[in-house]
Interface confidence: medium
């Protein structure tokens, strides 16, 4: 269920942009990333699809929003959100979110200047 | 209006050409891909080719590659498709369908003409 | 190019009841698939997009679900207007997109 933000204005378009685009691949490369060979791949179901393909998949995108830059946050919360109930620790949610931090600027965006990935009322 | 209205199909015999239009209204042509899909009389759908907002890089099916070329005129906001040499199993019903995505090529199709049949047939 | 293949061809559903039209792909895709409605005479209309995303002025009725090979559409209580034939399409690997065979959905 999505996050009711509460936010006016320009954010809205923000978050119709994030919602238009799939951000699936962005959630699978980074569980690829922070599990690594490990057995519980298996249940994220991303096997199949190179890490390197899923990078640039996820870029496509974010680069599909219109505003990618003024958006980009909004991006993150929700990949943040999305994956949230599958982070099995804390240790895995602050790694996580710090690959999450990486993803703008592997896809040669800046990050965005102050994002609170704390979503999911308190949860993550 | 948001739409898109077709033209310049009918009977044509094997080994002729044929050009289709598709005027688009509504909405900001040259910042979508365009694309055409055809679909045989009483059968399913099938991508043809498509086209990226400044005209640049069209592909095309492979069953119809060297015979169908696919433009736009983005001044009259406009997509063509010249069909030639061609063949009885082109027989069909042509739409022009615009691409919901703006920067990557061939995702899902948000708009579709209502269509012009052409049909080729000795 | 990969395969769709939809199943059932056609389907009779009594007014009310629940339509349920499956799709799968000859390889993964992950949720990279749309389903089209076509009434009789019309063009396709965009219903689903990213597997389960329903496109905007869609009932809620129509729903999708699934991800990598195997795909469903669901229409929770089926209403005249819903007489159509549906279709699946891929657009993981594009060009080229793929459809499905198409689903007739009758009243029964």
């Known amino acids: 269920m999505r996050r009711e933000r509460g936010r006016q204005g320009d954010s809205s378009s923000c978050e119709r942009q994030v919602d238009r685009v799939n951000l699936k691949p962005c959630e699978q490369h980074i569980m690829q990333r922070i599990m690594g060979e490990q057995e519980q791949y298996d249940s994220y179901d991303i096997r199949s699809t190179r890490s390197s393909d899923q990078q640039q998949r996820c870029c496509d995108e974010l680069n599909e929003m219109e505003n990618t830059q003024r958006c980009m946050c909004e991006a993150l919360q929700q990949i943040m959100e999305n994956q949230c109930d599958r982070l099995q620790d804390r240790q895995m949610v602050q790694q996580f979110k710090r690959e999450l931090m990486n993803l703008p600027q592997q896809c040669n965006f800046r990050a965005p200047q102050r994002c609170d990935l704390d979503v999911s009322g308190g949860r993550c | 209006e948001v739409q898109l209205v077709e033209s310049g199909g009918g009977l044509v015999r094997p080994g002729g050409s044929l050009r289709l239009s598709c005027v688009a209204s509504?909405?900001?042509?040259?910042?979508?891909?365009m694309h055409w899909v055809r679909q045989a009389p009483g059968k399913g759908l099938l991508w043809v080719s498509s086209?990226?907002?400044?005209?640049?890089?069209?592909t095309y099916a492979d069953s119809v590659k060297g015979r169908f070329t696919i433009s736009r005129d983005n001044t009259n906001n406009t997509l063509f498709l010249q069909l030639d040499s061609l063949r009885a199993e082109d027989t069909a019903v042509y739409y022009c369908?615009?691409?919901?995505?703006?920067?990557?090529?061939?995702?899902?199709?948000?708009?579709w003409g209502r269509g012009t049949l052409v049909t080729v047939s000795s | 190019d990969i395969v769709m293949t939809q199943s059932p061809e056609s389907l009779a559903v009594s007014l009310g009841e629940r339509a349920t039209i499956n799709c799968k792909s000859s390889?993964?895709?992950?949720?990279?698939l749309g389903w089209y409605q076509q009434r009789p005479g019309q063009p396709p209309k965009l219903l689903i997009y990213?597997?389960?995303k329903r496109e905007s002025g869609v009932p809620d009725r129509f729903s999708g679900s699934g991800s990598g090979t195997d795909f469903t559409l669901t229409i929770g209580r089926l209403q005249a207007e819903d007489v159509a034939v549906y279709y699946c399409?891929?657009?993981?690997?594009?060009?080229?997109?793929?459809f499905g065979g198409g689903t007739k959905v009758e009243i029964k």
């Open positions: 369908v615009r691409d919901r995505r703006a920067v990557t090529t061939a995702r899902y199709f948000d708009l």
């Open positions: 509504g909405f900001t042509f040259n910042t979508y891909w």
């Open positions: 086209l990226n907002k400044d005209g640049s890089s069209p």
């Open positions: 390889s993964n895709i992950d949720n990279y």
């Open positions: 990213w597997a389960s």
């Open positions: 399409q891929q657009y993981y690997t594009s060009p080229p997109v793929t």
